[in-house]
């Protein structure tokens, strides 16, 4: 119960790419404002976008401190114009979210080849490593730093005159495959945490093909 | 509990095809590739090929191109494997199994095919 | 596309015994094989992933090592129930091919 005309939060999900993470809920608000908490297990709460009329929270500054712990975040609703106002039991009205915990949960945002080269009938394709918001040392870390080993690559790849696909898999952000002289072909490559159970995958990266600018060619 | 059930044994006649089904259960049926693979009598495992069920995407060895066909029914979380043009030398027990990119780490039971006049 | 050698191709050894079998790649794998065991009439199992990592459930006497293009499964003390044929495979890229296999008999 709450006070008249304010309404809790509901359906708080997590929205988090390569540690990138939003709260978002529902209502659209009527009359009412929110204020976001967010802690670990075991941590104090602390106050975010402060009776904001958004529905989604940035929180990435908070979980990028430790990744690997687990949050829980709040929604609390407040009327209009009147914030100091409670619930009927003296509490201002909030819904708690799911857990979330970044580094098991996070999506793998879309990867980008970089480039490829081509060394005779050896190419060596290289992916992109890309920037998180996480931060060691007052640097950026890159997806390969957070994840080191248990991040994958694996690399499809095919003929450009053919639709038979192979794959290669690297737990750097380099391969090397064998390739026949003279043949043009196209790359994709999709990011993999095997351990995980969900959001194990990332969508494939726009494919890129020989013979365009990204490649470079030597006998 | 992680587990692939695959369809009975087949006897088909030489020149027909087939279709065979593997139902996954116990886990999220588009984060895995399914891999199909094949052990004829007596001898050892060749891999025939792998499909994505996320996007449906296929690999197949190149002994198998044109022999096999591999689709899913995510609604259904079933993978299908149909060998066509079928021949007494694709008489084999065929598997199923959940591929976790280092490994497969679970299998289906098999399911006998047996190709005879 | 790279081709896989295992050998022995099969072995007499007692209950107790060490056992090694090893497997050859044609190209650097870096550490992408797994190990299997197969009983007659059933499906394979998994023991050993990453060339290294012993799969869920599986007894540490059994164990795997190497990297690049040579590879070795250990059972250090044999035990009866693991008289069974033991495959290799590639899972680097595809074709994801497997050794001929290993038989594994008892003396």
């Known amino acids: 119960s709450g006070t008249t005309n304010t309404v809790a939060a509901y359906n708080l999900t997590w929205k988090s790419t390569n540690f990138k993470t939003i709260l978002e809920w529902e209502p659209k608000p009527v009359n009412q404002v929110y204020t976001v908490q967010i802690s670990t297990k075991s941590g104090d709460w602390k106050s975010k976008c402060f009776y904001t009329t958004d529905t989604e929270c940035d929180l990435t500054d908070e979980i990028v401190k430790d990744v690997k712990q687990t949050y829980l975040a709040r929604v609390f609703s407040y009327p209009a114009g009147n914030v100091e106002s409670t619930g009927s039991a003296g509490e201002p009205l909030y819904e708690n979210s799911p857990e979330f915990t970044p580094y098991l949960e996070t999506n793998l945002g879309q990867p980008t080849i970089q480039s490829f080269e081509q060394v005779g009938t050896k190419v060596n394709v290289t992916v992109e490593d890309e920037r998180t918001l996480v931060r060691r040392n007052n640097t950026f870390l890159s997806l390969r730093d957070v994840f080191g080993k248990d991040l994958i690559y694996t690399l499809y790849y095919w003929k450009s005159s053919s639709s038979g696909k192979k794959t290669a898999k690297t737990n750097t952000n380099e391969f090397l495959i064998d390739v026949d002289k003279g043949e043009n072909y196209c790359f994709s490559v999709q990011a993999v945490i095997p351990s995980r159970t969900v959001n194990r995958k990332s969508t494939d990266s726009p494919v890129e093909c020989m013979g365009q600018e990204k490649g470079e060619f030597r006998e | 509990e992680v587990q692939l059930q695959q369809s009975g044994p087949e006897l088909v006649k030489p020149g027909a095809s087939v279709k065979v089904s593997c139902k996954a259960s116990?886990?999220?049926?588009?984060?895995?590739?399914v891999y199909w693979v094949r052990q004829s009598p007596g001898k050892g495992l060749e891999w025939i090929g792998y499909?994505?069920?996320?996007?449906?995407?296929?690999f197949y060895d190149e002994n198998f191109m044109g022999k096999a066909t591999l689709t899913v029914d995510k609604s259904s979380s079933t993978a299908y494997m149909q060998l066509n043009s079928l021949t007494s030398e694709d008489s084999a027990v065929y598997y199923c199994?959940?591929?976790?990119?280092?490994?497969?780490?679970?299998w289906g039971q098999g399911t006998t095919l047996t190709v005879s006049s | 596309d790279i081709q896989m050698t295992q050998s022995p191709s099969s072995l007499s050894a007692s209950v107790g015994d060490r056992v090694t079998i090893t497997c050859l790649a044609t190209?650097?794998?870096?550490?992408?094989l797994a190990w299997y065991q197969q009983k007659p009439g059933k499906a394979p199992q998994l023991l050993i992933y990453a060339a290294t990592y012993l799969a869920d459930g599986v007894p540490s006497r059994f164990s795997g090592s190497g990297s690049g293009t040579d590879f070795t499964f250990t059972i250090s003390s044999l035990q009866p129930e693991d008289f069974a044929t033991y495959y290799c495979q590639l899972v680097y890229s595809s074709p994801s091919t497997f050794g001929q296999g290993t038989k594994l008999e008892i003396k």
């Open positions: 190209q650097t794998l870096d550490t992408w």
């Open positions: 499909i994505d069920p996320d996007n449906g995407i296929t």
């Open positions: 116990g886990y999220t049926f588009t984060h895995f590739n």
């Open positions: 199994a959940r591929d976790v990119t280092t490994a497969v780490d679970f």
